[in-house]
């Protein structure tokens, strides 16, 4: 999947199973990321879920679980809010679209996640206090999770690569993280149809065309243009909104 | 099976972890996978099975040939960061101020600078 | 939630033969070693066999060596215990377990080897 | 093979009283690395078994705090701080450190 890290990095990683995207004292999201056609490098989000830990006199311990073609508007023990505490309420799910999107206020914590089913798979977006971010006590998962440190090097796809490749008039196959490029989708095509829904054309729009080339699905575009607007909702510094790739002096560096 | 948490100290010793080294930063880039490969070593028992550990131990090769690092010579010590409290150590209230994140906030200093993140597509 | 589902247990004749299957879902199967254990009736636990997330190593304890095979097929989420030359003692439930340590287990399936 | 002996083998417990079971291996599971690879399983009556306690002292998502987990070398405890009607059944310990991999013979616990 595609990731935008708290310190507005953009990778696209090919991390495979169950990753660690959030885990400080008071909060735990994993994912688990599945290929997108077999044999594929490029993977996308099947699995998620989130632990709100025991706090104070504030919440219970909470466990979200969401998967494809099931996005709770629960909790997995089917409540709604914090428990049974004196603040129960500054924990609270709220069914956007039901069964397509959800949103979760951890007031006690000032943080607000979006999950979202577009197409097979799932999409996360988080606004989180930096003094949240950092509160990690146990050193040794120091630092463990994507969302503060991004994706290892040996696990990210340099899309930029691909899509000078891809822009090329006969490209290589080997250009393709996937072994299977559906032909039915040129580039024009996924370039105008991304257009439509993201005209800036920044590192959202980059990853847009780099789904459809990938995949040929274009619930892909969705995904991207929520992603964008979860981001407008999410981002405290609105000027940062819109990443754009900086010059590859390094490799492997995305934005 | 602690792999990722091998993972995690290798992407905090190196920084953002989204950068190849400088040629001047090789030397402790070299330090931080000798350190890699020894925890990955440690979690061999437990995860040697296991896809993550494999693509660990295969991706310190990689990169230790890439960066011409050799096997032996000084690792890395992690990096330790000042914490703030944690949430069970902070003064217990009966009252819903404690559980309302900007209120409690404002009692103390400016506004919290907020940060975001995001997973999507493939 | 993870989830093991063992099947393919039954009554077996001394030196027959059974396959088990273990049927797993709610994790990347692919990327997990998985493990055989057995119980047999009243007693306690003991480890069979292991195999790699791709199947490149398998390792098995002594009593059962030359005479199980474990396998996998990766494709299907499946894990497989192919039980040969059958023994009186081999009587147990079997589990299969996920993890190169094993951390969830299925619910077993009772495998009965009498005349 | 490592031989793990665990005791008492029967264990009689009060409701809300601690419990302890003891497990001894025939020879240290603290590997040339400093770790040690000793877990803990529950197996609940008519249930399947489930992971409590790994590496020592860890325990899984999902268990209760009641339930801790300490020793080193050789010898090792699980300790139960108030033991609930849902603790019923036996306790088995398991070395990961030596191949081949090895289970005690168990504990069963039962409410007085």
């Known amino acids: 999947p595609h990731l935008r890290t708290f310190t507005d990095h953009f990778q696209t990683c090919k991390v495979q199973g169950a990753w660690p995207l959030i885990d400080n004292n008071y909060l735990n999201v994993q994912v688990t990321n599945t290929p997108v056609l077999p044999g594929s490098a490029a993977t996308a989000t099947s699995k998620l879920t989130i632990i709100f830990k025991n706090f104070q006199e504030c919440v219970d311990q909470k466990v979200y679980q969401a998967e494809m073609d099931e996005l709770p508007s629960a909790f997995a023990d089917g409540s709604k809010n914090g428990g049974d505490k004196h603040g129960a309420n500054s924990l609270k799910i709220t069914e956007k679209v039901s069964g397509q999107h959800v949103e979760i206020q951890a007031k006690y914590i000032g943080t607000t996640i979006v999950v979202r089913q577009v197409g097979r798979y799932l999409t996360f977006a988080v606004r989180m206090p930096e003094e949240v971010v950092n509160a990690v006590e146990d050193r040794d998962s120091q630092g463990l999770y994507l969302c503060l440190r991004g994706c290892p090097l040996n696990q990210q796809i340099d899309f930029q690569a691909f899509r000078a490749n891809a822009e090329s008039p006969r490209r290589p196959a080997a250009a393709s993280p996937s072994p299977v490029v559906p032909e039915t989708f040129p580039y024009e095509t996924a370039v105008a149809k991304c257009k439509e829904k993201l005209p800036v054309e920044d590192l959202y729009y980059q990853a847009c065309v780099f789904d459809l080339l990938t995949t040929g699905d274009v619930n892909f575009t969705l995904a991207a243009y929520y992603a964008l607007e979860d981001g407008k909702m999410l981002h405290s510094n609105k000027d940062k909104l819109h990443l754009f790739e900086r010059t590859r002096e390094l490799p492997g560096a995305v934005a | 099976c602690k792999i990722l948490k091998c993972n995690s100290e290798f992407w905090s010793a190196t920084s953002s972890g989204s950068h190849a080294p400088a040629s001047d930063d090789v030397p402790e880039f070299c330090a931080a996978l000798r350190t890699y490969a020894l925890c990955t070593r440690r979690t061999a028992r437990t995860c040697r099975g296991d896809l993550a550990y494999h693509s660990a131990v295969h991706g310190i090769e990689d990169l230790m040939s890439q960066h011409n690092c050799s096997k032996d010579g000084p690792t890395s010590q992690p990096r330790v960061r000042t914490l703030p409290p944690a949430g069970d150590s902070q003064e217990r209230s009966d009252s819903p101020e404690i559980c309302h994140y900007e209120k409690s906030f404002h009692k103390h200093s400016a506004a919290p600078n907020y940060t975001h993140c995001g997973l999507f597509g493939d | 939630e993870v989830q093991l589902v063992e099947s393919g247990g039954g009554l077996v004749q001394p030196g027959g033969s059974l396959r088990l299957s273990c049927a797993a879902s709610g994790f990347t199967f692919s990327n997990y070693g998985m493990n055989w254990i057995r119980q047999a009736p009243g007693k306690g636990l003991e480890w069979i066999g292991m195999?790699?997330?791709?199947?490149?190593?398998?390792h098995y304890a002594d009593s059962v060596k030359g005479r199980f095979t474990i396998s996998r097929d990766n494709s299907k989420n499946t894990l497989y215990l192919q039980m040969n030359s059958l023994r009186a003692e081999d009587t147990a439930v079997y589990y299969c377990?996920?993890?190169?340590?094993?951390?969830?287990w299925g619910q077993g399936t009772m495998v009965t080897v009498s005349s | 093979d490592v031989v793990l002996t665990q005791s008492p083998l029967s264990l009689p417990v009060t409701l809300g009283q601690p419990a302890s079971i003891s497990c001894r291996s025939s020879?240290?599971?603290?590997?040339?690395?400093?770790?040690?690879?000793l877990e803990w399983f529950q197996q609940r009556p008519g249930q399947s078994p489930r992971l409590l306690i790994y590496e020592v002292s860890n325990r899984f998502s999902g268990v209760p705090d009641r339930f801790s987990g300490s020793g080193s070398g050789t010898d090792f405890t699980l300790k139960i701080s108030r033991v609930e009607a849902e603790d019923v059944g036996v306790y088995y310990c398991f070395q990961v450190t030596h191949d081949p991999v090895t289970f005690g013979q168990g504990t069963k616990l039962e409410i007085k």
């Open positions: 020879q240290s599971l603290e590997t040339s690395d400093g770790d040690t690879f």
């Open positions: 195999i790699y997330y791709d199947s490149s190593e398998k």
């Open positions: 377990a996920k993890g190169t340590t094993p951390d969830y």
